[in-house]
Amino acid sequence: GQNITARIGEPLMLSCKGAPKKPTQKLEWKLNTGRTEAWKVLSPQGDPWDSVARILPNGSLLLPAIGIVDEGTFRCRATNRLGKEVKSNYRVRVYQIPGKPEIVNPASELTANVPNKVGTCVSEGSYPAGTLSWHLDGKPLIPDGKGTVVKEETRRHPETGLFTLRSELTVTPAQGGTTPTYSCSFSLGLPRRRPLNTAPIQPRVREPLPPEGIQLLVEPEGGTVAPGGTVTLTCAISAQPPPQIHWIKDGTPLPLAPSPVLLLPEVGHEDEGIYSCVATHPSHGPQESPPVNIRVTETGDEGQAAGSVDGSGLGTLAL
């Protein structure tokens, strides 16, 4: 059989080999497509079938506007003038080229050494689905799950049957490189059809800011609190991107989600101890704050925490 690829909405003509110039009863087409439950037989004498396909005087089968449901197998059987039976067999597939793909929500800036969302590539109106691929400086970017991560999503329109593809790129750029140029391309995978390419994007790569010192702020001032009171510890650090903050009590990491604020409500003596925070930077490693001593006293007498304490409000501990 012969493989035929036709564009959706365009006419398709399939010739019946061996058909006599003026077909008689000796010609028939059989179709097995998305429109037919099994094989549908068409003959020259029959009525045109739902305006979907009709046999022309020369025996060819004409589909005026092919659609997704017309994908399938088409067979013609004809008897030529010599009485010999000639068969034609076609496997028909359809395609639709989408609009030019686009990168939506493109990043204008990326930070070195940390994961950054570059953008989302969107292609609408393809059939079959096809594929999206990302490119860096004109060459394919291969997702490795670490420095280059791609999240893909394919949706099919319930009425048209056409596909929308989305591909989100996240990268971890290296420090000190040249300005990267990212683009995305859509390919249907058809022979002799070049991919459709997005406009390129060129985000700046920013070096991560080194931390400028870490402060541990404590409230109430001095770190001394009556039983049942509340202590708030705040880890303050200026760094880009913001680091992850973990907490340590008496030298042991606390099993808490990373947060710059540690709240100790309704404290008891079991909450007493030496607290510090650790900031973890992807590019600069961990950095620990000076410690603060939290004491729970019945009398509420003011004891000094490690480090210096301002006159009122928050105690400030700085490197």
Epitope: H135, K139, I142, S183, R194
Partner: antibody, heavy 118, light 113 residues
Framework: QVQLQQSGPELVKPGASVRISCKAS????????IHWVKQRPGQGLEWIGW????????KYNEKFKGKATLTADKSSSTAYMQLSSLTSEDSAVYFC???????????WGQGTSVTVSS | DIVMSQSPSSLAVSVGEKVTMSCKSS????????????LAWYQQKPGQSLKLLIY???TRESGVPDRFAGSGSGTDFTLTISSVKAEDLAVYYC?????????FGGGTKLEIK
């Protein structure tokens, strides 16, 4: 058919600037990169940089940063290259070329001769 | 920068002869993820601009006669003209588009005896 029509020859004085043009026809101007290439007799071909007219993003050869400035006008489907602070080293034929993504430079302009002389 | 070296710098052949010219790069032009070599060949006839003959080292541009063939991978590439015609008188350049800045070879001048 695809055509890139470049502006005519230029005779300019040292220290001056010149702007050469490359008018595209026969395709969607905003869908392809335009590259610029310098050719000096006996010096071979040097890549200057590219511009993507769709969003006027550019990429330059470090050697030509500060020397060449690439721009594009979508309404007239024309790409431009401005060369500044000209010296005799800038005397050359300059070509524009369409670049079909990673399929190389598939159509070239006829070239513009720039002569720097006092 | 990637340095492209072409040899010979010129050669003279008779019409109908087969000709080969070489292009070497200072680093690989083969991109492992898609197994494509980012190398192109161009023809420049006297007084004219350039014409793309071959891209991806071996893919002939549409409309280019099949007597032109590109081969090679990595750092060593060859352009072959199977049966030279008088109109093939030109300078042939290789160019890498693997990395910035894109660079060209010095060219091979083909003369007809």
């Amino acid at each position: 058919q695809v055509q890139l029509q470049q502006s005519g020859p230029e005779l300019v004085k040292p220290g001056a600037s010149v702007r050469i043009s490359c008018k595209a026809s026969g395709y969607t101007f905003t869908d392809y990169y335009i590259h610029w290439v310098k050719q000096r007799p006996g010096q071979g071909l040097e890549w200057i940089g590219w511009i993507y007219p769709g969003n006027v993003i550019t990429k330059y050869n470090e050697k030509f940063k500060g020397k060449a400035t690439l721009t594009a006008d979508k309404s007239s489907s024309t790409a431009y290259m401005q060369l500044s602070s000209l010296t005799s080293e800038d005397s050359a034929v300059y070509f524009c070329a369409r670049y079909d993504y990673d399929y190389a430079m598939d159509y070239w302009g006829q070239g513009t001769s720039v002569t720097v002389s006092s | 920068d990637i340095v492209m070296s072409q040899s010979p710098s010129s050669l003279a052949v008779s019409v109908g002869e087969k000709v080969t010219m070489s292009c070497k790069s200072s680093q690989t032009l083969l991109y492992s993820s898609n197994q494509k070599n980012y190398l192109a060949w161009y023809q420049q006839k006297p007084g004219q601009s350039l014409k793309l003959l071959i891209y991806w080292a071996s893919t002939r541009e549409s409309g280019v006669p099949d007597r032109f063939a590109g081969s090679g991978s990595g750092t060593d590439f060859t352009l072959t003209i199977s049966s030279v015609k008088a109109e093939d008188l030109a300078v042939y350049y290789c160019q890498q588009y693997f990395g910035y800045p894109y660079t060209f070879g010095g060219g091979t001048k083909l003369e007809i005896k």
